[in-house]
Interface confidence: low
Amino acid sequence: FERTRSLQDPCSNCPAGTFCDNNRNQICSPCPPNSFSSAGGQRTCDICRQCKGVFRTRKECSSTSNAECDCTPGFHCLGAGCSMCEQDCKQGQELTKKGCKDCCFGTFNDQKRGICRPWTNCSLDGKSVLVNGTKERDVVCGPSPADLSPGASSVTPPAPAREPGHSPQ
């Protein structure tokens, strides 16, 4: 946390984009190139984040805000503020140390990221399997076998695919 500055503190007058320069009798100096201060009253400017390697620049650094990075095509962000990039895989796969591998039987992944998760066990809810699972899709559960009277028909809706970008970050 930052202690509340006294009313006498000349640094409190320095706006975002500047710093209170102790070497110059506490006047407000603009942040040097490739640095920023997002709040007023700062005694130093922070170095701008550089989006290098697998990171690419989503938003350039300005004197008042840090750069924001995302990942190059074929990779997606992980962690707060896109602190890491992880390789994309296809649906029906997960990333392992040896690269993208197909989901094992009984598991699925409907996204380009994340891990293969087990198919829903319909019987735990007293239901039956209406549509079998695949590597890319979960099973679709339907009414319990007892609920299906002879002659009754059911229309199987497709398993809903989650929108990309809604998986763990």
Epitope: F75, G79, S83
Partner: antibody, heavy 121, light 107 residues
Framework: QVQLVQSGAEVKKPGSSVKLSCKAS????????INWVRQAPGQGLEWMGN????????NYNQKFKDRVTLTVDKSTSTAYMELSSLRSEDTAVYYC??????????????WGQGTLVTVSS | DIQMTQSPSSLSASLGERVTITCKAS??????LSWYQQKPGKAPKTLIY???RLVDGVPSRFSGSGSGQDFTLTISSLQPEDIATYYC?????????FGGGTKVEIK
């Protein structure tokens, strides 16, 4: 085989700085993050930061951001961690450890033997 | 930062006994959790990553479970060589943060 060999123990005065080294061998140095983790005597583990040798991209734990500098020398496959403004509570064993390139499955699979830093007046 | 609360801080169990250690995250960390074993004077060793995946070469008596905020490390049958301190680590967000550790001793 993969090895991370760290520099020897250090005794430092409060207010001074220490620079530790971690020499990697047995793998492609550029393709793994080097992390620094410390452990005070009888205490738990604390991540300090990491560096990606290929382009020297760094992430720092905000707790240490103003006092820690991570660097690498690719020509010797060596990572360095400098900690400044030392205080007695920085007395700890400092480990370097690696994690794989892009796949952020943070398995610290190989560790250095650790360097004991003692800060005492 | 994400806080990791590990319990118990220490435990004493008999050889062959089942041992359970829990770790609770201050927010949802998906399955981005690993478990480490540390013996005195040694560097930690990874046992499990992604909450439930055993690292190659780790005995199958070790297992991990959980997702979201609550995670468990289980040793199905405690062996003498399992005497150590165990740490959980979240790596869903930087900075990665460790639990406080659980010291496992023989009764």
């Amino acid at each position: 085989q993969v090895q991370l060999v760290q520099s020897g123990a250090e005794v430092k005065k409060p207010g001074s700085s220490v620079k530790l080294s971690c020499k990697a061998s047995g793998y492609t140095f550029s393709s793994y993050w080097i992390n620094w983790v410390r452990q005070a005597p009888g205490q738990g583990l604390e991540w300090m930061g990491n560096i990606y040798p290929s382009d020297s991209y760094t992430n720092y734990n905000q707790k240490f951001k103003d006092r820690v500098t991570l660097t690498v020398d690719k020509s010797t496959s060596t990572a360095y961690m400098e900690l400044s403004s030392l205080r007695s509570e920085d007395t700890a064993v400092y480990y370097c450890t690696r994690t794989w390139e892009f796949y952020y499955d943070s398995v610290f699979d190989y560790w250095g033997q650790g360097t004991l830093v003692t800060v005492s007046s | 930062d994400i806080q990791m609360t590990q319990s118990p801080s220490s435990l004493s169990a008999s050889l062959g006994e089942r041992v359970t250690i829990t770790c609770k995250a201050s927010q949802d960390i998906n399955s981005y959790l690993s478990w480490y074993q540390q013996k005195p004077g040694k560097a930690p060793k990874t046992l499990i990553y992604r909450a439930n995946r055993l690292v190659d070469g780790v005995p199958s008596r070790f297992s991990g479970s959980g997702s979201g905020q609550d995670f468990t490390l289980t040793i199905s049958s405690l062996q003498p060589e399992d005497i150590a301190t165990y740490y959980c680590l979240q790596y869903d967000e930087l900075p990665p943060t460790f639990g406080g550790g659980t010291k496992v001793e023989i009764k």
